[in-house]
Interface confidence: low
């Protein structure tokens, strides 16, 4: 069946450069045309380049023309997309897409890869606790957290207790600070009568920078 | 270019409701319209093609109509996997040009949020930061307001909100609100209060906490 | 204004052979791609194949890959359809269209009026 897998994404800094491939396989590349598609975080879908089936023809969004540059090599089943002059705003997760015979809409998708535009370097998050208080209580339920700060790239991920709660628990999307780098909070509600007797700890993973840490968030003493 | 516009942005609806989406184009693109459907993390999903072609293996209950200028996507029953954004696209142009998107979410029943604040914590002090923190927990629909007061002072510009995907078994969404200072700042002032606004409280819920104290 | 004429048409046996023609008149039509659909009696017109711009190449759909031949004559602004080793399934109306863009994207322009090829088992 027709497989479009993509690859060659990451973290590069404004100015510099990087190249997507797109491995086709399941179809005789050299009929079809494809192009690549890109979607911001937690934006829409956004066309950014053709190449037609032969090579003869290529077109550009304008937001990427004079930057970007498509090709393709038949003996390698492969689609490129070189991009120089990468801005903040080329970050998003890039696509590859086939068409239907010479219908120029999506048929078949490739996975997906992202490439994040950032001056920041790779940074292990600071884990501080988010401690449950009267402030944080409230009918019999308590609520208690960690904050991730200040790491990049993107993911981490976060648990509870090695995976043992899941109930009540919501990490949050990440968002990016005016500094470059990434925060996020992770919470849990419980009931308030646990808190005494029941250890919360929570676990952070942070693979771009090898960074894990287990928290322990208890009630503040005062 | 041609511009599309989908109309709404967002659509609540239940299991079992009928839907229509609406896609416009700025100008005739006869019938060369496509929809996809999209889940968080994945790529999209060809739902039709021709404006009212549906592509092999997609449930009959997606139909597609239009020609000209407007189009319409409906789901004529909706399904728990129906729950999605939806993009409708045009191919009538070299410029390949897809709408904003349309995201249809669970229609639960209001539900006001639970409100917790959280104090920065001493390590976090130690290194020259406050971030104060408010948890809006399980609240439905998604619109919600909140508002930092510092001393009774207004606070803009130095807040930044998440909010979480819909749940799946109870369609409430959470939200966190992160007030961030320096460490000068914040032992500058005493109360911290974040004021929430929502349809599921008659009037606005205050926590607030007095620095320093437990 | 572009007009497109089909032709060659007809009533032919399992096995047999057919060339269809589509003469354009009103522009020059080398710059262009030009597809042939077909439409079977009460199903959806489909694509068959495309004779992309000179020098292009063409394309096939599944079912005519291997038995239909599409080639143009920019001099005679025609571009043919040979159809061989037909099957009573090939039985439809067909279409020729021309596509304007440069990636021919689907958004066919102009149509013919279509030529009844009938195959009798």
């Known amino acids: 069946q027709v497989q479009l897998v993509q690859s060659g994404g990451g973290v590069v800094q404004p100015g510099r450069s990087l190249r997507l491939s797109c491995a086709a396989s399941g179809f005789t590349f050299s009929r079809y045309t494809i192009h690549w598609v890109r979607q911001a975080p937690g934006k829409g879908l956004e066309w950014v380049a053709v190449m037609s089936y032969n090579g003869n023809n290529k077109h550009y969004a304008d937001s990427v023309n004079g930057r970007f540059t498509i090709s393709r090599n038949d003996s390698k089943n492969t689609l490129y997309l070189n991009m120089n002059s990468l801005r903040p705003e080329d970050t998003a997760v890039y696509y590859c897409a086939r068409i239907r015979d010479t219908a120029m809409f999506f048929a078949h998708w490739g996975q997906g890869t992202l490439v994040t535009v950032s001056s920041a370097s790779t940074k292990g998050p600071s884990v501080f606790p988010l401690a449950p208080s009267s402030k944080s209580t409230s009918g019999g339920t308590a609520a208690l957290g960690c904050l991730v700060k200040d790491y990049f790239p993107e993911p981490v991920t976060v648990s509870w207790n090695s995976g043992a709660l899941t109930s009540g628990v919501h990490t949050f999307p990440a968002v990016l600070q005016s500094s470059g780098l990434y925060s996020l909070s992770s919470v849990v509600t419980v009931p308030s009568s646990s808190l005494g007797t029941q250890t919360y700890i929570c676990n952070v993973n942070h693979k771009p920078s090898n960074t894990k840490v287990d928290k322990k968030v208890e009630p503040k003493s005062c | 270019d041609i511009q599309m516009t989908q109309s709404p942005s967002t659509l609540s609806a239940s299991v079992g409701d009928r839907v229509t989406i609406t896609c416009r184009a700025s100008q005739s693109i006869n019938t060369w319209l496509a929809w996809y459907q999209q889940k968080p993390g994945k790529a999209p999903k060809l739902l039709m093609y021709k404006a009212s072609s549906l592509e092999s293996g997609v449930p009959s209950r997606f139909i597609g109509s239009g020609s000209g200028t407007e189009f319409t996507l409906t789901i004529s029953s909706l399904q728990p996997d129906d729950f999605a954004t939806y993009y409708c696209q045009q191919y009538n142009s070299d410029s390949k040009m897809f709408g904003q998107g349309t995201k249809v979410e669970v229609k639960g029943t209001v539900a006001a949020p639970s409100v917790f604040i959280f104090p920065p914590s001493d390590e976090q002090l130690k290194s020259g930061t406050a971030s104060v923190v408010c948890l809006l927990n399980n609240f439905y629909p998604r619109e919600a307001k909140v508002q930092w007061k510092v001393d009774n002072a207004l606070q803009s510009g130095n807040s930044q909100e998440s909010v979480t995907e819909q749940d799946s078994k109870d369609s409430t969404y959470s939200l966190s609100s992160t007030l961030t200072l320096s460490k000068a700042d914040y032992e500058k002032h005493k109360v911290y209060a974040c004021e929430v606004t929502h349809q599921g409280l008659s009037s606005p819920v205050t926590k607030s906490f007095n620095r320093g104290e437990c | 204004q572009v007009q497109l004429q089909e032709s060659g048409g007809g009533l032919v046996q399992a096995g047999g052979s057919l060339r269809l023609s589509c003469a354009a008149s009103?522009?020059?039509?080398?710059?262009?791609?030009v597809s042939w659909f077909r439409q079977a009696p009460g199903k959806e017109r489909e694509f068959v194949a495309v004779a992309r711009r000179t020098g292009d190449g063409a394309f096939y759909s599944d079912s005519a890959e291997g038995r239909f031949t599409v080639s143009r004559d920019d001099a005679k602004n025609t571009v043919y359809l040979q159809m061989n080793s037909l099957k009573p399934e090939d039985t439809a109306i067909y279409y020729c269209?021309?596509?304007?863009?440069?990636?021919?994207?689907?958004?066919?322009?102009?149509w013919g009026q279509g030529t009844q090829v009938t195959v009798s088992s």
């Open positions: 269209a021309i596509d304007s863009s440069t990636f021919y994207t689907g958004s066919y322009d102009y």
């Open positions: 009103g522009r020059t039509i080398s710059r262009y791609a």
